[in-house]
Interface confidence: low
Amino acid sequence: VLPAKPENISCIFYYEENFTCTWSPEKEASYTWYKVKRTYSYGYKSDICSTDNSTRGNHASCSFLPPTITNPDNYTIQVEAQNADGIMKSDITYWNLDAIMKIEPPEIFSVKSVLGIKRMLQIKWIRPVLAPHSSTLKYTLRFRTINSAYWMEVNFTKEDIDRDETYNLTELQAFTEYVMTLRCAPAESMFWSGWSQEKVGTTEEEAPYGLDLWRVLKPAMVDGRRPVQLMWKKATGAPVLEKALGYNIWYFPENNTNLTETVNTTNQTHELYLGGKTYWVYVVSYNSLGESPVATLRIPALNEKTFQCIEAMQACLTQDQLVVEWQSSAPEVDTWMVEWFPDVDSEPSSFSWESVSQARNWTIQKDELKPLWCYNISVYPVLRDRVGQPYSTQAYVQEGIPSAGPVTQADSIGVKTVTITWKEIPKSKRNGFIKNYTIFYQAEDGKEFSKTVNSNILQYRLESLTRRTSYSLQVMASTNAGGTNGTKINFKTLSISHHHHHHHHHH
């Protein structure tokens, strides 16, 4: 059987390296060898490239090497397939070297911002050494922000033969890291070089983008002054790299700018002491290039009635998040401020806050909160410059069993009764919401009994005990994760009724 006619001939000119053609079929049933017939020098010369018939198997590719590679030139290529049964020739194909030339990638040596030109990066590269000198090269520049998965592309051409070339990429984000890579090809060629090594550059810093501003209103002091804790942070959407040198605060009573006071600080929090009237507070951040837009906050008068619109709130846990959702009776409110901090007996060490827009839910990754800690979460409605009444809830991202059980004592011991009282477990030792308490009690050598009561009960009267009997007793506090017993106490019921109370404290 004759070999199949070679088809799908494809040739590529690797500049100053070789001229390679491939074809199909790649495999033949019987051993086949190939000749590639070429005419070059615009048809004046011809030669042959043979596949290596010393290697068994088919080889549907052949390369012509310098010095017979002439450029510019037009080649014709015909492939002959031969086996024991005969020869089969392909159609003659025509190749213009300029159209199939492939060159090395360029080398980017710098990606830098240009002083005073915002949101631009200048890319400098070296043309490939192995590229035709007089050739116009076309380029594709690919770029993306450092944390993005998507490349954007820009195409351009360079006519000159200067080996040090530049391109100015504009309309970028300020103070942002970009990754660049470049490829090139002779203007007429269908084959692009590979991509250059990636290079990173950062756009110039600008004046800060803006601030998010919030406050905590504290109770008025005896002298009538109100402590107001101001806090601010970089606005959502600000460039990741943005840094501020400092912050200017100014504040004044409403309708009386004559009483304006100013403060400069490098902290992101500041305590003001205000009178009972309505105040306005303004904060800007600044760096060496200028100031951010002003962040404004209205502090209501002491006696001002605030609006209430949050009707209900739920906190629920997903696999790796805490989600808080709320319902509102005011459809016009679409901005909310969420505060969260640990519920501890002392002043909370960490206080966090975040603005939510156009949603009635807030989500936080569980790993941003500590397990076994109770968090207070409050949501404030914000309508233009007015802040409404908050709605608060508590949540644990992970509950555990309490670190200690309740401290218990037996009071009012009678003949057949006893009143048990116990103290709430300190917040730091609860490790979860206390669901209930269980009282375990047992007479000496007798059966153990238990009684479970709600978490809001801290006292219980046991009845139907046996007179003049020693009992041991302990109270267990339970969370969703399980329970922990308090210390065991012992008491003995009386043999006859007394009119006065006995207080036994056995620990």
Epitope: T140, R142, T145, S148, A149, Y150, W151, M152, E153, V154, N155, E171, L172, Q173, W192, A359, N361, T363
Partner: antibody, heavy 122, light 107 residues
Framework: EVQLVESGGGLVQPGRTLKLFCVAS????????MTWIRQAPGKGLEWVAS????????YYPDSVKGRFTISRDNAKSTLYLQMNSLRSEDTATYYC???????????????WGQGTLVTVSS | DIVMTQSPTSMSISVGDRVTMNCKAS??????VDWYQQKTGQSPKLLIY???NRYTGVPDRFTGSGSGTDFTFTISNMQAEDLAVYYC?????????FGGGTKLELK
């Protein structure tokens, strides 16, 4: 107003070829990646092909790689999908979509055409 | 490729209901999840981008939440015109992938 108008769909036999067209208007075509998404009758959405704003790079899922070719003519604000070696499982409505733009990838598929139905059947 | 698993596949609801559907990504996609609505015989329409941002002109009864691998889409007060199939899509990494859809039907 942004508009994307697809055409070129129809009934075709398995193994044959078909070319879809999408003419864009109302925006600067060469600032945007463009994408073809398809939806088999009664089924969900499947990404088919994307092309970068300059046409320099193209992307395909394995299900169509080697058979479908996405291309564009920025001068004509037109997107193409050349479909070769068609199979019955390619039967679907093919939507032309825009996104993302030069500055980033905030919204992927904001604008969709009305779709063009391709039926592959003998 | 990242697989987006949507649940439930269909729901029977009444006007005024609160409707919640979920989408789970096979790996972390940050907040790069969009939600689309497709009514019968129409092209899909973007409702929510970047997990929780409502697209221009979308009513505020539509909300989205989540990040990482778990995402939720809620219609707080179901209207008759909301009957449609809803799809989630991740755009965090190539290729973009869609969930199988949740179809809303009237009881």
């Amino acid at each position: 107003e942004v508009q994307l108008v697809e055409s070129g769909g129809g009934l075709v036999q398995p193994g044959r070829t078909l070319k879809l067209f999408c003419v864009a208007s109302g925006f600067t075509f060469n600032n945007y990646w463009m994408t073809w998404i398809r939806q088999a009758p009664g089924k969900g959405l499947e990404w088919v092909a994307s092309i970068t704003n300059t046409g320099g790079s193209t992307y395909y899922p394995d299900s169509v790689k080697g058979r479908f070719t996405i291309s564009r003519d920025n001068a004509k604000s037109t997107l193409y999908l050349q479909m070769n070696s068609l199979r019955s499982e390619d039967t679907a409505t093919y939507y032309c979509t825009r996104g993302p733009d030069y500055g980033g990838h905030l919204n992927w598929f904001v604008y969709w055409g009305q779709g063009t139905l391709v039926t592959v059947s003998s | 490729d990242i697989v987006m698993t949507q649940s439930p596949t269909s729901m029977s609801i009444s006007v005024g209901d609160r409707v919640t559907m979920n989408c789970k990504a096979s790996q972390n996609v940050g907040s790069n999840v969009d939600w689309y609505q497709q009514k019968t015989g129409q092209s899909p329409k973007l409702l929510i981008y970047k997990a929780s941002n409502r697209y221009t002109g979308v009513p505020d009864r539509f909300t989205g939440s989540g990040s990482g691998t778990d995402f939720t889409f809620t219609i707080s007060n179901m209207q008759a015109e909301d009957l449609a199939v809803y799809y989630c899509m991740q755009s965090n990494s190539y290729p973009p992938t869609f969930g199988g859809g949740t179809k809303l039907e009237l009881k």
